[in-house]
């Protein structure tokens, strides 16, 4: 039994890091493998993560972490029974994938303005709370070409757009994702999408 692709990990910089790897053949990850992890400065026994299958030869493990600070460095040991298959380390702050924003809501009752709001996925005491920026994706269910991205580079989790920038009388969907420049993170997953019917009063044309 050998590791074909070494574990790569990403952290949500809050409580979970996710590690994925591939074995050289079909593997029952949860019964055959264990991923042990521990902060390098601690002298307590390492935590044990029981991996799940992620395709035939792929494994994924969700490492629980109480708190994360930028200096944290974890040792990682991948075991198959008494055999050490791979040994490495992981610094969560260097591999951050933020949590996805939630509670995306479209408010359509503000004159002819659409107000989109969502929730910051981090609590106020987390470092990323004040460092997230967002991308909002709006698209038409009827017209695949009607697809747009709005970059929200301010901290407030909201976006205002004129309803008239979208077509009237058709349905749109929106979703939002986050990233943090300070840790050069990857983008989060997209939030669940929300749907609304876009309608607004056409301005009277004067002849």
């Amino acid at each position: 039994m050998k590791v074909l692709q070494e574990p790569t990990c990403v952290s949500d910089y809050m409580s979970i890091s996710t590690c994925e790897w591939k074995m050289n053949g079909p593997t029952n990850c949860s019964t055959e493998l264990r991923l042990l992890y521990q902060l390098v400065f601690l002298l307590s026994e390492a935590h044990t993560c029981i991996p799940e299958n992620n395709g035939g030869a792929g494994c994924v493990c969700h490492l629980l972490m109480d708190d994360v600070v930028s200096a944290d460095n974890y040792t990682l040991d991948l075991w198959a029974g008494q055999q050490l298959l791979w040994k490495g380390s992981f610094k969560p702050s260097e591999h951050v994938k933020p949590r996805a924003p939630g509670n995306l809501t479209v408010h359509t009752n503000v004159s002819d303005t659409l107000l989109l709001t969502w929730s910051n996925p981090y609590p106020p005491d987390n470092y990323l709370y004040n460092h997230l920026t967002y991308a909002v994706n709006i698209w038409s269910e009827n017209d695949p070409a009607d697809f747009r991205i709005y970059n929200v580079t301010y901290l407030e989790p909201s976006l205002r757009i004129a309803a008239s920038t979208l077509k009237s009388g058709i349905s749109y969907r929106a979703r939002v994702r986050a990233w943090a420049q300070c840790y050069n993170t990857t983008w989060s997953e997209w939030s669940p999408s929300t749907k609304w019917h876009n309608s607004y009063r056409e301005p009277f044309e004067q002849h």
Partner: antibody, heavy 119, light 107 residues
Framework: QVQLVESGGGVVQPGRSLRLSCAAS????????MHWVRQAPGKGLEWVAV????????YYADSVKGRFTISRDNSKNTLYLQMNSLRAEDTAVYYC????????????WGQGTLVTVSS | DIQMTQSPSSLSASVGDRVTITCRAS??????LAWFQQKPGKAPKSLIY???SLQSGVPSRFSGSGSGTDFTLTISSLQPEDFATYYC?????????FGQGTKVEIK
């Protein structure tokens, strides 16, 4: 709940030896690094030593290096501090403390045991 | 060894006051800083770890901040039970070291 009970303190002459014990309960002792911290009368806290969960690694403060030895018996859930060549400046209350696991830190502490080095 | 210097060494304050205690490390400690409270004749009690993480059960009036070498413990509104001595501790590298303590007394 976690409980740490130190014992073995007392009055000892300079140059003599003493062994402190710490009985642990309420948690999986064999899984945690354990520390000794001391406090001289009316003074601040001083970290003394640490031992890894399996006893394979130990670290000491410079002030006790070569004189004190930290050890553990996981079958008895007990931590030890062997103190040799004791000096007057070793007079203190000695606390044993459980290491955190990336979360709760040095909590709770035992009630401590007083070591007095005096002729 | 890393030296930890607290200031002030003592302070007098009244109930309801906002109190700030600072701790300076002789070199960067990567936010591996803890704060402890100790009352006379009692064992220390953990308040904060990793610079700003509140120990379970500790009131939210206690908060920690800082980075690099300079750190702060703040009590937003001092309560009668908060009169005690406070210690910082670095656990970035062995030997782990404590500050000399700050005694918070009643004015």
């Amino acid at each position: 709940q976690v409980q740490l009970v130190e014992s073995g303190g007392g009055v000892v002459q300079p140059g003599r030896s003493l062994r402190l014990s710490c009985a642990a309960s309420g948690f999986t002792f064999r899984s945690y690094g354990m520390h000794w911290v001391r406090q001289a009368p009316g003074k601040g806290l001083e970290w003394v030593a640490v031992i890894s969960y399996d006893g394979s690694q130990t670290y000491y403060a410079d002030s006790v290096k070569g004189r004190f030895t930290i050890s553990r018996d996981n079958s008895k859930n007990t931590l030890y501090l062997q103190m040799n060549s004791l000096r007057a400046e070793d007079t203190a209350v000695y606390y044993c403390v459980k290491e955190g696991r990336s979360g709760s830190w040095f909590d709770p502490w035992g009630q401590g045991t007083l070591v007095t080095v005096s002729s | 060894d890393i030296q930890m210097t607290q200031s002030p060494s003592s302070l007098s304050a009244s109930v309801g006051d906002r109190v700030t205690i600072t701790c300076r490390a002789s070199q960067a400690i990567n936010n591996y800083l803890a704060w402890f409270q100790q009352k006379p004749g009692k064992a220390p009690k953990s308040l904060i770890y990793a610079t700003s993480s509140l120990q379970s059960g500790v009131p939210s009036r206690f908060s920690g901040s800082g980075s690099g070498t300079d750190f702060t413990l703040t009590i937003s509104s001092l309560q009668p039970e908060d009169f005690a001595t406070y210690y910082c501790q670095q656990y970035n590298s062995h030997p782990w070291t404590f500050g000399q303590g700050t005694k918070v007394e009643i004015k």
